[in-house]
Amino acid sequence: MANNDAVLKRLEQKGAEADQIIEYLKQQVSLLKEKAILQATLREEKKLRVENAKLKKEIEELKQELIQAEIQNGVKQIPFPSGTPLHANSMVSENVIQSTAVTTVSSGTKEQIKGGTGDEKKAKEKIEKKGEKKEKKQQSIAGSADSKPIDVSRLDLRIGCIITARKHPDADSLYVEEVDVGEIAPRTVVSGLVNHVPLEQMQNRMVILLCNLKPAKMRGVLSQAMVMCASSPEKIEILAPPNGSVPGDRITFDAFPGEPDKELNPKKKIWEQIQPDLHTNDECVATYKGVPFEVKGKGVCRAQTMSNSGIK
């Protein structure tokens, strides 16, 4: 029940924020109109209208970024609990530690904000619908990939090393990382891990990255990959690569050979179909359908303490 209350509170908060933005926009519009009248030139008015449209567009983009960030969150948009509430300390994952509710964003088409609201969901749906039109064109281009099975081999999972991490300038719960993934230039990655991993533990950390999600802006910062984490409603842990891994090492799956897509087509929801079969097993080893995330010749990827947990 407490969870439901929290969700409802957040919904109300989002509603209030939306009202404030609308009010602010109304004020801006009227100010611009007054200004145009005062200056009394058609040319100036036209210029202001263009400016106003730009502002609106910018706001729309920001809204969409927020929304997309959350669509991509793995959140499943807070389905209201229908089952019996459970005591999390009973899990076979003996050492799952209770902690507060959780947010892990990263990038691409499936950020990891764990915990979204109904407003966010609606907004996400809008974005997805808009995206659908554009993607119809892309579909024919990507059509050749249709014959490929939808399994983990489609994902470009690689070892990365976080070179630097800093707080996102405009979002308290997000980090912005520069990550070496074995390419010429590092990739910028936005992750919602602020409430789960201290900043100093992010520096020079080896991580597993999903590299072929469509890059997405996260509160104004373009995120080019997603940090893979073991995740439960209580806790998030960054998955750890095996010792001896180096940036750029590929994660492979014995039973699922195949080359990853260059970029996952968001329209086809490939990540969304694969993600439910990603779990840590009883030994905290990251797996797809029970097959370990493996760096050939070096070992498997693990969570620190979270067994039988989802991966996002």
Epitope: T84, L86, A88, S90, V92, S232, D282, G299, N308, G310
Partner: antibody
């Protein structure tokens, strides 16, 4: 192919000891938790013990019915798991299976029979 | 400990008909993650058990789509549609939410 082969079963008297073994091949043994499950003649399955991997400090877990009498151990260099059974009771008579599972992939040995009788 | 209780089948089941095996747990196996920590195993006569279903409803590799798992937090059903000879054996449910891991007493499926 994955193989789990149990050995060391046999006939013992109550209060005596016995150590059964399981040799694993065909998968990365050191990454897998290992379990012993038993089945008394004509009865259902009963979980007995579990041992975790080195990164999880080889933590062990036991069913209440065997706690203090049975000890599970492993040797990753030999891909072996063992069950040391002390102070055996007649109700420990069962087929003992060595097993490991990871979602889609679960592996069971053919079982080894342990009979405790006076 | 979590107690798993299995129901009996009206044996034998006519070939080609469907069979539903039920299992009840003394405590909800639905975790806050939304996953239900329940496995189904089949032990064919003279063989070791093998996994059919995990997370209550996910079929393991190579398991026929005639088998499906469903349920709530405490009441579970394994449905076998169009029963065949290869389905004969004892079916066990098992919880893996907490230790000790516990199995149901088993449900025997025989074919007419």
């Amino acid at each position: 192919a994955v193989h789990l082969v149990e050995s060391g079963g046999g006939f013992v008297q109550p209060t005596e000891s016995l150590k059964i073994s399981c040799a694993a091949s065909g998968f990365t043994f050191s990454d897998a938790a290992m379990y012993w499950v038993r089945q008394a003649p004509g009865k259902g399955l009963e979980w007995v013990a579990r041992i975790r991997t080195k990164p999880n400090n080889y933590a062990t877990y036991y069913a209440d019915s065997v706690k203090g009498r049975f000890t599970i151990s492993r040797d990753d260099s030999k891909s072996m798991v063992y069950l040391q059974m002390d102070n055996l009771k007649t109700e420990d008579t069962a087929m003992y299976y060595c097993t490991s599972w990871s979602y889609d992939f679960d592996y069971w040995g053919q079982g080894v029979m342990v009979t405790v009788s006076s | 400990d979590i107690v798993m209780t299995q129901g009996a089948l009206p044996n034998p089941v006519p070939s080609g008909e469907s069979a539903s095996i039920t299992c009840q747990s003394s405590k909800s196996l639905l975790h806050s993650s939304g996953k239900t920590y329940l496995n189904w195993y089949l032990q064919r006569p003279g063989q070791s058990p093998h996994l059919l279903i995990y997370w209550m409803s996910t079929r393991a590799s190579g398991v026929s789509d005639r088998l499906s798992g469903s349920g709530s937090g405490t009441d579970f059903t394994l449905k076998i549609s169009s029963v065949e000879a290869e389905d004969v054996g004892v079916y066990y449910c098992q919880q893996f939410l907490e230790y000790p891991l516990t199995f149901g007493s088993g449900t025997k499926l025989e074919i007419k």
